[in-house]
Structure formats: C-alpha cells, structure tokens
C-alpha cells in the first residue's frame, strides 16, 4: 500500500516560557527530495495554518522570518518548536507532510498533538 503515515506525540506540555517542541515522523513511500511540512491548529472543527516550511532532503528546515515555528530535520523526522504560546493557544496541533518532488505527490496528516499551555503566574511585588 503506497500511503504515507505520519506519527506525532499525543500530548505535549509547553514550557513556562510558552515554548512547545515535538517530533513529526513520516514513513515515506518514495524517495522524496523536496518535502513540505505544515503545522495546523484545529479548534472547534476549524483548521488554521500555524506555519509551513519546504525543505530539500539533507538541508535545514527554514520557516519564514516572522514565523513562530523553528525546526530541524533528520531523515524522515522533523523536530518542530513553536514559540510564543499562551494559554489561549492550547489546542490540537496537526503535522501535515507533503512529498512535493519527485513525482508522485504524497500527502500525510498526523492525528495531532494536544499542546497544553499554562500562563505563568505573575511574580508578586517584592519589598527589600
């Protein structure tokens, strides 16, 4: 069966600084040289793009300068980091992988990673 399976962790807890990292791994049915990775957020059945990057196999993953995502790639594995998260950003983050070149094209969509973000408590004023 020539299908592409995408695996990602079920749950991730963001750090107190609003940073969440997870691995998106795909089982490639072909030898792709160009891959596009997109992070989607699903909330109330609405899906929105968080960030996307296209990379050549063996090269680094480059997101746009203003992207909240960074990442590194190693073989069929992509290490994704999302920054600047707040409690209201808690939700399901889906990893979408597309094998762009050479043909044929393949699409793979993960089941999503539930990212929990807890805003840090404000520090109480200290009198010294």
């Amino acid at each position: 069966c020539k299908a592409m399976h995408v695996a990602q962790p079920a749950v991730v807890l963001a750090s107190s600084r609003g940073i969440a990292s997870f691995v998106c791994e795909y089982a490639s049915p072909g030898k792709a040289t160009e891959v596009r990775v997109t992070v989607l957020r699903q909330a109330d059945s609405q899906v929105t793009e968080v960030c996307a990057a296209t990379y050549m196999m063996g090269n680094e993953l480059t997101f746009l300068d203003d992207s909240i995502c960074t990442g590194t790639s190693s073989g069929n594995q992509v290490n994704l980091t999302i920054q600047g998260l707040r409690a209201m950003d808690t939700g399901l983050y889906i990893c979408k992988v597309e094998l762009m070149y050479p043909p044929p094209y393949y699409l793979g969509i993960g089941n999503g990673t539930q990212i929990y973000v807890i805003d840090p408590e404000p520090c109480p004023d200290s009198d010294f």
Partner: antibody, heavy 118, light 106 residues
Framework: QVQLVESGGGVVQPGRSLRLSCAAS????????MHWVRQAPGTGLEWVAV????????YYADPVKGRFTISRDNSKNTLYLQMNSLRDDDTAVYYC???????????WGQGTMVTVSS | EIVLTQSPGTLSLSPGERATLSCRAS?????LAWYQQKPGQAPRLLIY???SRATGIPDRFSGSGSGTDFTLTISRLEPEDFAVYYC?????????FGQGTKVEIK
C-alpha cells in the same frame, strides 16, 4: 468571503489555444495548492492539473501532459491554465478548486465552459 | 493510478428514506472525500478524511470506511439532497474521482 471565479472559456477550433483564469479572494492564496478539474458534458469529474504554493511544483493528468500548462501569480491571487493543441475531447466545463488545509478540494469556482469545435 | 468505482450508478429513493452509496478503490486509499453536485452547479465538499463532515454540512450526511471500501450515508433524504455524488482520493497523485452515483426521486 472565500471565493474562486473562473474566466476565459469559449468556443475554439481544434488545434488552437485558450487561456483560462481563476481569480481568488478571501484567503491567503499562496498558502494553498490549486487544482483544475474538468467535466465533459454529461460525464463525471476529471482531475486536470495542480500547482503548489510558490508555483515551483506542478503535476498534470496524462491526457493533457505536454499540451496544458498550469501557472499562478501570487501577487495577483490568480491561477491560470494555458491550453494548447486543443482537441474535441477537451470540451468540458473547467473548474478551479482549492486544496484545503487537510487536502480535500474545499472551495470550487463556478466553472467556465470550453467548447472545441470546427 | 487508483481507480475508484462507485455503486450503484443510480439510486431511486423517496424523501425521508435512507441512502447508502458505495465507493471501492483498486488499492488502499489513505484520504477519501465525498462531493455533491447539482445540475449546473460546481461540486461541493461534503466529507473529507473518509468520515469528517465539511463546514456547514448537515449531520444527516455521514461517511465511513477505510482501506478500499467506503460508504456515504444520508440518513433521511431531504428534497435538496437529490443530486450526483462523487468520491475522490487525494492522498497521492494523480487525484482521481469515482464515476458518480445519481440519487433521484422515486
């Protein structure tokens, strides 16, 4: 609102050329793959071509390979289909469609009719 | 190329009845969608990922199946549901559609 509007259809003689356009609005055009799908009179849907994101990667159905060229201008939010060496069996309604975030064709234009006849 | 075969070709039913449409693939399919098309109109996405309803689609429409066998069910036919329905695979190129099932009023 999210919308796709095709134009450029018409009646053309076999062997001649035609260029279809698809104007997109209401979404970030460059973030989506765009397809052309056609439907000959009284028949089903047939996928024609796709162009991805920045426009570098394109795929074509075998019956149109070498004759049709798909392109896009992200600055104008417009998709194109250049059709050369047209044949009788290219007669169809041509639809542009957006490949949604999860891959399915979630937005379609109203279609433009292309008739190839001598 | 993945070939999709829909059955039956035509389904004659009355409003209020249940409609069951089948789509069989020549090889395993990872991503399957269903579309509705009325005369003179563009297709409309109903179901994606085999079983997820698209935005604004009534819950009388449901999709099921995996691998090579898929089903679209309309629990109670409304007058506006009489149309042609197409399945499509979108997991790999070339993108392919079934030949369609026409749901007509009996």
């Amino acid at each position: 609102q999210v919308q796709l509007v095709e134009s450029g259809g018409g009646v053309v003689q076999p062997g001649r050329s035609l260029r279809l356009s698809c104007a997109a609005s209401g979404f970030t055009f460059s973030s989506y793959g765009m397809h052309w799908v056609r439907q000959a009179p009284g028949t089903g849907l047939e996928w024609v071509a796709v162009i991805w994101y920045e426009g570098r990667n394109k795929y074509y159905a075998d019956p149109v390979k070498g004759r049709f060229t798909i392109s896009r201008d992200n600055s104008k939010n417009t998709l194109y289909l250049q059709m050369n060496s047209l044949r009788d069996d290219d007669t169809a309604v041509y639809y542009c469609a957006r490949a949604g975030d999860l891959g399915a064709f979630d937005i379609w234009g109203q279609g433009t009719m292309v008739t190839v006849s001598s | 190329e993945i070939v999709l075969t829909q059955s039956p070709g035509t389904l004659s039913l009355s409003p209020g009845e249940r409609a069951t449409l089948s789509c069989r693939a020549s090889q395993s399919v990872s991503y399957l969608a269903w579309y509705q098309q009325k005369p003179g109109q563009a297709p409309r996405l109903l179901i994606y990922g085999a079983s997820s309803r698209a935005t604004g689609i009534p819950d009388r429409f449901s999709g099921s199946g995996s691998g090579t066998d898929f089903t679209l069910t309309i629990s109670r036919l409304e007058p506006e549901d009489f149309a042609v329905y197409y399945c499509q695979q979108y997991g790999s190129s070339p993108w392919t559609f079934g030949q369609g099932t026409k749901v007509e009023i009996k």
